[in-house]
């Protein structure tokens, strides 16, 4: 698994560097998770031909994966820092059940899948500290999540491969949109 943010060789070699600000820490955390996703996608793409499938072909799925839209306040048009922050945190909380699903989906990258899951939990904590309006954040219902997880795990092999690919692709896209918006704050 990759070294967590703040513990890379560059930081060790530069002990006099200013401590990271909250924004820099969040930025680094997202980039660390993106690295993890990249490694997981490599294994998925090597295992199946899902990565060659067009977006349109893959769109025919019943997964309700979080996605950024203009109304969420994270795009430049209609940018709203607080609305956007709530969307990012809510989206990450919604992704957690899907990240749990990924845990038994990898052979050589099992550790990496765990690192992505744990790092996402840490990222949520960082972002919650930054958010002012925590009341607006809706936490997914555990019972609903549990039945969704059971349903996903009961799919046939091909659908499970497809689901894995879609989760990784959507999570990457969501994180990239979040990273872009957070840098505008």
């Amino acid at each position: 698994a990759p070294v967590p943010p703040g513990e890379d060789s560059k930081d060790v070699a530069a002990p006099h560097r200013q401590p990271l600000t909250s924004s820099e820490r969040i930025d680094k955390q997202i980039r660390y998770i993106l690295d993890g996703i990249s490694a997981l996608r490599k294994e998925t793409c090597n295992k199946s031909n899902m990565c060659e499938s067009s977006k349109e072909a893959l769109a025919e799925n019943n997964l309700n994966l979080p996605k950024m839209a203009e109304k969420d306040g994270c795009f430049q048009s209609g940018f709203n820092e607080e609305t956007c922050l709530v969307k990012i945190i809510t989206g990450l909380l919604e992704f957690e059940v899907y990240l749990e699903y990924l845990q038994n989906r990898f052979e050589s990258s099992e550790e990496q899948a765990r690192a992505v899951q744990m790092s996402t939990k840490v990222l949520i904590q960082f972002l919650q500290k930054k958010a002012k309006n925590l009341d607006a954040i809706t936490t997914p219902d555990p019972t609903t999540n549990a039945s969704l997880l059971t349903k996903l795990q009961a799919q046939n092999q091909w659908l499970q491969d497809m689901t894995t690919h879609l989760i990784l692709r959507s999570f990457k896209e969501f994180l990239q949109s979040s990273l872009r918006a957070l840098r505008q704050m």
Epitope: T21, E24, D27, R31, L34, D35, S38, K55, M68, C74, F75, Q76, S77, R169, K172, E173, Q176, S177, L179, R180, R183, Q184
Partner: antibody, heavy 119, light 107 residues
Framework: QVTLKESGPTLVKPTQTLTLTCSFS??????????VGWVRQPPGKALEWLAF???????YYSPSLESRLTITKDTSKNQVVLTMTNMDPVDTATYYC??????????????WGQGTLVT | DIVMTQSPATLSVTPGDRVSLSCRAS??????LHWYQQKSHESPRLLIK???QSISGIPSRFSGSGSGSDFTLSINSVEPEDVGVYYC?????????FGAGTKLELK
């Protein structure tokens, strides 16, 4: 291999609207992490960033020119279009389109078109 | 807006010299800093990405360093073909901003 090419009028009258098209190949603007932007350079001067559009249709504009600029994409045609209204002689410049693509959204412009001089 | 300040404006060098070009951002931009080279009558080309990441096809004599708001582009042994204008760019947040450039010329 990645290529970008700008096209549009070379001569524009004051108050007219300039429409520039960036046609590209070798990548898709539906891939997450991809963005295409416009940069201009008046003769003998520095580079000036104008506008940027991302895979998810998020758009950014130079604050000083925002009211005059519109950027759009046609993913199926592999094209990005920039329109600039109310042209003025000070807008005389070489207009470049350029691509950015990486996981971290560094906004590093790794491929550029040859540029088109607009007077 | 993040303002990028480059110095010197012009640098007169002899082939074989080691040179350093400076770029300063008006606020911290972490490692979101890129360098471009533009030769006369050519499009700019990306030279260094993210402070120090080398770009495929760019000679190894070009290197970058710095962090936060102070950055340096070094050419360890200038070649005649390195003549041109060098720009740094803020890649942290929009609006994207370029420095005014450093012109590298031969003595």
């Amino acid at each position: 291999q990645v290529t970008l090419k700008e096209s549009g009028p070379t001569l524009v009258k004051p108050t007219q609207t300039l429409t520039l098209t960036c046609s590209f190949s070798g990548f898709s603007l539906s891939t997450s992490g991809v963005g295409v932007g416009w940069v201009r350079q008046p003769p003998g001067k520095a580079l000036e960033w104008l506008a940027f559009i991302f895979w998810d249709d998020d758009k950014y504009y130079s604050p000083s020119l925002e009211s005059r600029l519109t950027i759009t994409k046609d993913t199926s045609k592999n094209q990005v279009v920039l329109t600039m209204t109310n042209m003025d002689p000070v807008d005389t410049a070489t207009y470049y389109c350029a691509r950015s693509y990486d996981d971290y959204l560094y906004y590093a412009l790794d491929y550029w078109g040859q540029g088109t001089l607009v007077t | 807006d993040i303002v990028m300040t480059q110095s010197p404006a012009t640098l007169s060098v002899t082939p074989g010299d080691r040179v350093s070009l400076s770029c300063r951002a008006s606020q911290s931009i972490s490692d979101y800093l890129h360098w471009y080279q533009q030769k006369s009558h050519e499009s700019p080309r990306l030279l260094i990405k993210s402070v120090s990441q080398s770009i495929s096809g760019i000679p190894s004599r070009f290197s970058g360093s710095g962090s936060g708001s102070d950055f340096t582009l070094s050419i360890n042994s200038v070649e005649p073909e390195d003549v041109g204008v060098y720009y740094c760019q803020n890649g942290h947040s929009f609006p994207l901003t370029f420095g005014a450039g450093t012109k590298l010329e031969l003595k």
